[in-house]
Interface confidence: low
């Protein structure tokens, strides 16, 4: 099980002193990256028990393996469900603490109930402040059951749940009808997935026989030991004031674990620390009792004395839980409660024993979970013990489970079970990720999800050019940092793979899937300069540039022109995809805008140095088109045009421009200026007889405006060929030769 403990400080005279602390004993707990150990989370769970909103609670992290929640301002802040989440991947575990108000109408006789599948669970709510109304039972916040007030038995309301199944697990509450939910009795029911003493997918495996109130986990068969006990079967007591799977944590404060509630992963639940009991864990055990909640009885024999933290303390010459075993009986010594090996390794396991008569090599045997018995290959005999060494055949996954070392002499026998965890070396499920690339280096994230078991001890990155048969280059990297592969060839594909290892012999996993990463092209180094530019209209700009002459081929795929409109904070980019191009027409620009212009060479995705910038002012756009343009033939060489001034003029018109074109003709059109902007009529002279002409016009203020609609008209017949059209306005007879 995950080594995760949620401690609640139950000294409740002042809510502001109340705190919850979540402590993880896991390796690398809380480092914060998904693949290598997510952070510890500690929060109030308001999904089932909602309390009035108050100031936010304060979360303080003490290193990577401890987090504390403070900032409770009033007693109602404390009521409800709190949870701590820790562990990584499949081992991610939630530990739950349920807090009851000491002033509630109803109080639970026992908050946490752990029962086996098929058992009958009995939740008992003690009447603290009586009300003559129904008692409503809820399960996970939903109505479950109602009891009448006269159904109290000995001042308690009982909820019997026969034949419970795992889905029955959850938060139960008993509330007087229409009383505040904060006055409820809150319970936590944990239903193991198997019947008593069994575990595993089909509940076919036998639990190791957890001691001292430990609870057998229905998924992995491990004992979840009460606070203050350790070992595969919780057989060993910690020193007073210590807890955690290896007794590595110490209770805060001078009074040790007094006043603290300990919550551990399911199916254990919560209890006081070893040596303490009571609703606030402030009462020491009565004589003859010990352990978490003082639930255990010493029953010491042969002069043993009862210690409320550890149980029987045996006099010299005796051992055993109740000091019932004579030291003459052989005894397994210092056997580790848990061993870990990697798949397909062939480890050596040692088992030491003492006794009188002295154990010899043949009297010590090792039994695997499948019942296979291994005999030792050699034994080391010392004055105080015999150590048998066993060579284990190649390990398979089925070897995970409880192994047993057994010693038998004429003085009796002893055995010690220990857990063997066969771990699968990690194999990356994905290829490493390319973060950035340059022409001679790749920056790679080696952090990938993996199958198999952690923790990850080393990460190797293997790489070589694609389609190459040369040896792989390998670097060992820190899994939490990005890696830069250096001294690579430009514009080259590299095959890159990750290999993960876990601690111990044979911990190297298979290589992960390859990925192709390609280095970038060489950076273009030439700096262009702008030769010139000219405006071809209010929204069009033609730009030309040059490059310095250098020997060898040009390193570049094209040019990037950038126009920066500082007023609007907008950049326009124009890609010229030929490296031979030296001119470009930019269209669709904004009239009347001041642009900063530069050009740079690009190669692949890399940009070379930009040219020195130029500043270009586009003329503003002209006025709207003249309205209602009309043409009328006057003779065989004259046509009169009439129009109306444009509407919504931004300023005074400086002139009109008329465009004349022979209909269907191939030549360029002629433009004629009308320099008297107040006019609304003009005569175009010098036209050819019997010829159809097209006319349109536009106004100019600072820049030329939009063209009007085009009109058609034919001159009258039988005239002579004219020299070319000229214009005469109605106010003045002067013409303009074109």
């Amino acid at each position: 099980a995950v080594d995760l403990t949620l401690l609640a400080n139950l000294r409740l005279t002042d809510p502001q002193r109340f705190f919850l602390t979540c402590v993880s004993g896991e390796a690398g707990a809380g480092r914060g990256s998904d693949a290598w150990g997510p952070p510890l989370l500690l929060e109030k769970d308001d999904r089932i028990v909602r309390t009035p909103p108050g100031p936010p609670l304060r979360l303080a992290r003490n290193g990577s393996h401890q987090v504390t929640l403070r900032g409770f301002s009033k007693p109602s802040d404390l009521v409800g469900v709190f949870s701590c989440v820790g562990g990584a991947g499949a081992r991610r575990t939630r530990v739950i603490y349920v807090h009851n108000s000491p002033g509630a109408h109803l109080l639970p006789d026992k908050v946490t109930h752990t029962v086996n599948k098929g058992d009958t669970a009995v939740l008992s709510a003690r009447v603290h402040k009586e009300k003559q109304t129904d008692v409503i039972w809820k399960s996970n916040g939903s109505y479950f059951y109602t009891l009448d007030w006269h159904e109290a038995q000995d001042g308690r309301f009982l909820l019997q749940l026969p034949n419970v199944q795992p889905p029955s697990s959850g938060i139960y509450s008993a509330t007087y009808l229409e009383a505040s939910p904060l006055g409820s009795a809150f319970f936590r029911l944990i239903v193991r997935g198997c019947g008593a003493g069994r575990w595993g997918p089909g509940c076919t495996k036998e639990c190791p026989g957890c001691l001292h109130g430990g609870v057998c986990h229905d998924h992995d068969g491990e004992c979840v030991c009460p606070p203050g006990f350790t070992g595969t079967r919780c057989e060993q007591a910690c020193r007073e004031g210590r807890f955690g799977q290896s007794c590595q944590e110490q209770c805060p404060g001078i009074s040790g674990c007094r006043g603290l509630t300990f919550c551990l992963p399911d199916p254990y639940g919560c209890s006081c620390g070893s040596g303490w009991r009571g609703s606030q864990c402030q009462e020491a055990c009565a004589p003859g009792h010990f352990g978490a909640d003082c639930r255990l009885q010493c029953q010491c024999q042969n002069g043993g004395t009862c210690d409320r933290f550890s149980g029987c303390v045996c006099p010299s010459g005796w051992h055993g839980v109740h000091c019932e075993k004579s030291d003459r009986i052989p005894q397994i010594l210092n056997m580790a409660s848990e061993l870990e090996f990697n798949l397909e390794t062939m480890p050596r396991i040692n088992c030491a024993a003492a006794g009188n008569p002295f154990p010899v090599r043949g009297s010590i045997e090792l039994r695997k979970p499948d019942g296979t018995v291994l005999l030792s290959t050699k034994a080391i005999v010392e004055p105080e013990k015999t150590t048998a060494e066993f060579e284990v055949p190649r390990l398979v996954l089925a070897d995970s489970g409880f192994w047993e070392c057994r010693v038998s002499t004429s003085g009796g026998q002893d055995s010690r079970r220990f857990k063997v965890n066969v771990k699968v070396p990690p194999v990356p499920l994905a290829a490493p990720r390319l973060l950035t690339k340059q022409s001679r280096q790749l920056v790679v994230s080696p952090l990938v999800s993996f199958s198999g078991d952690g923790p990850i001890s080393t990460v190797r990155l293997h790489y070589r050019p694609q389609d190459s048969t040369m040896d792989w280059s390998t670097i060992v990297v820190d899994p939490s940092e990005n890696v830069t592969l250096m001294n690579l060839r430009p514009k080259t594909g590299y095959s890159v793979r990750v290999q993960l290892s876990r601690p111990g012999e044979g911990g190297e996993g298979a290589w992960g899937p390859p990925t192709l990463m390609t280095t970038d092209c060489p950076e273009p180094l030439l700096q262009p300069w702008l030769e010139g530019w000219h405006v071809e209209g209010t929204d069009r700009l033609r730009v030309s540039w040059s490059l310095p002459l250098v020997p060898g081929p040009l390193v570049g795929d094209g040019f990037l022109l950038r126009l920066w409109d500082g007023t609007r904070g907008q950049e326009r980019r124009e890609n010229v995809s030929s490296p031979q191009a030296r001119t470009a027409l930019l269209t669709g620009l904004t009239p009347g805008t001041h642009y900063q212009l530069d050009v740079q060479l690009y190669h692949c995705t890399l940009l070379g140095p930009a040219s020195p910038p130029a500043h270009v002012l586009l003329p503003p756009s002209g006025p709207p088109a003249p309205r209602h343009l009309h043409a009328q033939a006057l003779s065989d060489s004259e046509i009169q045009l009439t129009w109306k001034h444009p509407e919504a003029l931004p300023g005074p018109i400086s002139k009109y421009v008329v465009e004349v074109q022979v209909a269907g003709g191939a030549g360029d059109p002629l433009w004629i200026d009308v320099d008297r902007p107040e006019e609304t009529s003009t005569i175009i002279r010098g036209l050819n007889a019997s010829t159809r002409y097209l006319f349109r016009m536009r106004a100019s203020i600072q820049g030329l405006g939009d063209w009007s609609n085009t009109v058609e008209e034919s001159t009258l017949g039988n005239g002579l060929q004219a020299e070319g059209p000229v214009q005469e306005s109605r106010a003045a007879e002067e013409g303009l030769d074109q």
Partner: antibody
Framework: EVQLLESGGGLVQPGGSLRLSCAAS????????MYWVRQAPGKGLEWVSS????????NYADSVKGRFTISRDNSKNTLYLQMNSLRAEDMAVYYC????????????WGQGTMVTVSS | DIQMTQSPGTLSLSPGERATLSCRAS???????LAWYQQKPGLAPRLLIY???RRGTGIPDRFSGSGSGTDFTLTISRLEPEDFAVYYC??????????FGGGTKVEIK
């Protein structure tokens, strides 16, 4: 005198609606859980719905869930049953009843009102 | 749902005789949350017993209730003429719905 008096019954077509009322007197209405119980002609008793004192908690038999709505007006000492989408099998005498103390045993009953569902 | 089964369906007795009515639940009725009612033709039911054995207000002591778990009994020690009616049991201690038995008719022999 403690009394419950139902009204609002009558003839209605299948798919139609009716609203039953139950006027309470002689006790503190707002402190009691109230119930509707029905009895089809010649048949036994069937619990229909419950409403707790404040009106915040209501429960229904599966046969009426989603069609019937129980409510109460504590200021008027009145219990209601809104019946929609009525079916032939809803035809019965409808009684309102009071829960004894905090109990679901019914110590006071009204005289009943007949609901006939027929086309 | 908890089914309530009453027996016998009809009980033919004479005034002065002892009547024993049975009510059986399909599963345990918690803490004796069982009631008995009397109903006369054209009238509303009347609460006799609640909590399996407690008499309702104004109920004569010739009516008594007993039993627990799944088996309950209503006893009328000496039948009076006004006691001839239909009697229903009702469980109210389990998860909803509240359920009634089918009734026992006590008729004059």
């Amino acid at each position: 005198e403690v009394q419950l008096l139902e009204s609002g019954g009558g003839l209605v077509q299948p798919g139609g609606s009716l609203r039953l009322s139950c006027a309470a007197s002689g006790f503190t209405f707002s402190q009691y859980t109230m119930y509707w119980v029905r009895q089809a002609p010649g048949k036994g008793l069937e619990w229909v719905s419950s409403i707790y004192p404040s009106g915040g908690w209501t429960n229904y038999a599966d046969s009426v869930k989603g069609r019937f709505t129980i409510s109460r007006d504590n200021s008027k000492n009145t219990l209601y049953l809104q019946m929609n989408s009525l079916r032939a099998e809803d035809m019965a005498v409808y009684y309102c009843a009071r829960g004894r103390g905090g109990s679901k045993a019914f110590d006071i009953w009204g005289q009943g009102t007949m609901v006939t569902v027929s086309s | 749902d908890i089914q309530m089964t009453q027996s016998p369906g009809t009980l033919s007795l004479s005034p002065g005789e002892r009547a024993t009515l049975s009510c059986r639940a399909s599963q345990t009725v918690s803490s004796g949350s069982l009631a008995w009612y009397q109903q006369k033709p054209g009238l509303a039911p009347r609460l006799l017993i609640y909590g399996a054995s407690r008499r309702g207000t104004g109920i004569p002591d010739r009516f008594s209730g007993s039993g627990s778990g799944t088996d309950f009994t209503l006893t009328i020690s000496r039948l009076e003429p006004e006691d001839f009616a239909v009697y229903y049991c009702q469980q109210y201690g389990s998860t909803l719905p509240l359920t009634f038995g089918g009734g026992t008719k006590v008729e004059i022999k």
